[in-house]
C-alpha cells in the first residue's frame, strides 16, 4: 500500500540534489585554496543531517550547526556586499570586483544557491515532489531556515563599510520582509560596522528620479540609524555602465555619474 505523502505548496527538492551539493563543494574547494581542507563528504552528511527524517515545518537553526561549523570561512569583513531582490547584478559585480563577496561567494551560500530541499518526518527519503512554501505552509522549512542562518552569520561577520545592492524597479525598494530587511539589517554589529551604503539600481533607461529619497529607503535609514550605524546611499542610474566601469575604471566615460 503506497504511504500517504504530505503535499506542500512549494516545488519539491531540486533534481539530483545530493550530487549537485557534492559537486559544488568539490568545485568550490578546488577554486578556493583556503577551503581545500574541507571534506566534502562530511559537508554533505552534515547538510543532509539538518533536514533528513525531520518534519519540514519544524527545522531550527540548531539543525544546521554541524554544517555551519564545517563551512566556517573567513571573508574580509570590510568587503561584504549584501543584496535584496537583485541577485544577478550583485553576482556579476563580485565576479568582476573579485575582492568583494556576496553570501553566494562563500562556500555555504554557493552550495545552496537556487536549490530547494526538504525531507519527510521519520523517513530517510528526500521529498522531490513538494516542499513547504514560506507563505502558504510554514516559515521554519529547511530552505528558509538555512538562508536565515547563513544570512545572520554573514551579517554578523561584517565590519567597516557594508554595501547593499537594492532593486530600484520594485515597488518596495527596501522590503522589511526580505532576508536583508528581516535578518541582515538587524544582525549588523554596530560596534564593528560604521556605515551601511545602499546602492539603488535603476531599471529604466531614462530615469532621473532620486531613489535615495524613496520612502522605503528613508525607512531603512531610520532602522539603521537607530542601531547607531551611519547610512549613505547612491543611485546607480546605469547598471550596465556601472559594471563596465568596474571592469575598466580608467575609461574616460567613468568619471561622470553612472
Amino acid at each position: 500500500v503506497p504511504r500517504w505523502r504530505q503535499q506542500w505548496s512549494g516545488p519539491g527538492t531540486t533534481k539530483r540534489f545530493p550530487e549537485t551539493v557534492l559537486a559544488r563543494c568539490v568545485k568550490y574547494t578546488e577554486i578556493h585554496p583556503e577551503m581545500r581542507h574541507v571534506d566534502c563528504q562530511s559537508v554533505w552528511d552534515a547538510f543532509k543531517g539538518a533536514f533528513i527524517s525531520k518534519h519540514p515545518c519544524n527545522i531550527t537553526e540548531e539543525d544546521y550547526q554541524p554544517l555551519m561549523k564545517l563551512g566556517t570561512q573567513t571573508v574580509p569583513c570590510n568587503k561584504i556586499l549584501l543584496w535584496s531582490r537583485i541577485k544577478d547584478l550583485a553576482h556579476q559585480f563580485t565576479q568582476v570586483q573579485r575582492d568583494m563577496f556576496t553570501l553566494e561567494d562563500t562556500l555555504l551560500g554557493y552550495l545552496a544557491d537556487d536549490l530547494t530541499w526538504c525531507g519527510e518526518f521519520n523517513t530517510s527519503k528526500i521529498n522531490y515532489q513538494s516542499c513547504p512554501d514560506w507563505r502558504k505552509d510554514c516559515s521554519n522549512n529547511p530552505v528558509s531556515v538555512f538562508w536565515k542562518t547563513v544570512s545572520r552569520r554573514f551579517a554578523e561577520a561584517a565590519c567597516d563599510v557594508v554595501h547593499v545592492m537594492l532593486n530600484g524597479s520594485r515597488s518596495k525598494i527596501f522590503d522589511k520582509n526580505s532576508t536583508f530587511g528581516s535578518v541582515e539589517v538587524h544582525n549588523l554589529q554596530p560596534e564593528k560596522v560604521q556605515t551601511l551604503e545602499a546602492w539603488v539600481i535603476h531599471g529604466g533607461r531614462e530615469d532621473s528620479r532620486d531613489l535615495c529619497q524613496d520612502p522605503t529607503i528613508k525607512e531603512l535609514e531610520s532602522i539603521i540609524s537607530k542601531r547607531n550605524i551611519q547610512f549613505s546611499c547612491k543611485n546607480i542610474y546605469r547598471p550596465d555602465k556601472f559594471l563596465q566601469c568596474v571592469k575598466n575604471p580608467e575609461d574616460s566615460s567613468c568619471t561622470s555619474e553612472i
Partner: antibody
Framework: EVLLLESGGGLVQPGGSLRLSCAAS????????MSWVRQAPGKGLEWVST????????YYADSVKGRFTISRDNSKNTLYLQMNSLRAEDTAVYYC?????????????WGQGTTVTVSS | QSVLTQPPSASGTPGQRVTMSCSGN????????VYWYQQVPGTAPKLLIY???QRPSGVPDRFSGSKSGTSASLAISGLQSEDEADYYC???????????FGGGTKLTVL
C-alpha cells in the same frame, strides 16, 4: 501639535556668518528628513538644502554649495543651517520644513520663518 | 528664472473653477512626483497636493492635482475668497540634483 520654530536670523554684513536653528516638537524628529527653503522679499520659494535622518545624505542648491552647511542634532530635536560668506542675494525669510511621511520630496510642516538680512 | 514655469497670475470669481499650470521637462516633472503649496501672504507655505494628485488630510476636495508628461496642473473648484494666495509647484530635478520650485502663480478671487 507638530511645530517648527526657526531662530537665529538677523542683520549681517556681506561676507559675514550666521547660524539658523529650527526647534522641532510634536513628532519624532529622528524619523524625518528635514529641509531649509528661503523666500527673498517679493519673490518665490527657493529650496536651499535637505538632510536625511542620520545626516548620511545631504543635498544643497547650487547657489549655496560650499557656503552653507546643514546639520541636525537628533538628541536636541534641532535642525541647523550654518551660513558663511553671506551675500546680499541671501537676504530672505528662511523656513525649515519637515518631509511628508512615506513620501519623496513633499514638505508637510513648515515653520513661520526667520528673516536674514545681508547688508552693509 | 525658475526651472518650473508657472503663469504669474490667475483669477476667478467665487464659485468658479480655476486651473493653473506648471511646465517642466523629462528630468523633473515627467520622471518625478509633483507637489503643490499654497502661501497666503505673510504666512508660511502649506502642502496642498503631494505625489501628483494626493491631498493631505484637512485639504478640501475642491483642490485637485494632475500630471501629464512634462506638465502638471492644479484645479480649484468652487472658488472661495480664502483661496486668494500664491500657489507653487515643486518637484525633484534629476539633472540638477535638486528640489525645484516654480515661480508661483498669484490667484486673485474677484
Amino acid at each position: 501639535e507638530v511645530l517648527l520654530l526657526e531662530s537665529g536670523g538677523g542683520l549681517v554684513q556681506p561676507g559675514g556668518s550666521l547660524r539658523l536653528s529650527c526647534a522641532a516638537s510634536g513628532f519624532t524628529f529622528s524619523d524625518y528628513w528635514m529641509s531649509w527653503v528661503r523666500q527673498a522679499p517679493g519673490k518665490g520659494l527657493e529650496w536651499v538644502s535637505t538632510i536625511s535622518i542620520s545626516a548620511g545624505i545631504i543635498y544643497y542648491a547650487d547657489s549655496v554649495k560650499g557656503r552653507f552647511t546643514i546639520s541636525r542634532d537628533n538628541s536636541k530635536n534641532t535642525l541647523y543651517l550654518q551660513m558663511n560668506s553671506l551675500r546680499a542675494e541671501d537676504t530672505a525669510v528662511y523656513y525649515c520644513a519637515k518631509d511628508n511621511w512615506n513620501d519623496y520630496y513633499g514638505m508637510d510642516v513648515w515653520g513661520q520663518g526667520t528673516t536674514v538680512t545681508v547688508s552693509s | 528664472q525658475s526651472v518650473l514655469t508657472q503663469p504669474p497670475s490667475a483669477s476667478g470669481t467665487p464659485g468658479q473653477r480655476v486651473t493653473m499650470s506648471c511646465s517642466g521637462n523629462n528630468q523633473n516633472i515627467r520622471d518625478n512626483y509633483v507637489y503643490w503649496y499654497q502661501q497666503v501672504p505673510g504666512t508660511a507655505p502649506k502642502l496642498l497636493i503631494y505625489k501628483d494628485d494626493q491631498r493631505p488630510s484637512g485639504v478640501p476636495d475642491r483642490f485637485s492635482g494632475s500630471k501629464s508628461g512634462t506638465s502638471a496642473s492644479l484645479a480649484i473648484s468652487g472658488l472661495q475668497s480664502e483661496d486668494e494666495a500664491d500657489y507653487y509647484c515643486a518637484t525633484w530635478d534629476g539633472s540638477l540634483k535638486a528640489r525645484v520650485f516654480g515661480g508661483g502663480t498669484k490667484l486673485t478671487v474677484l
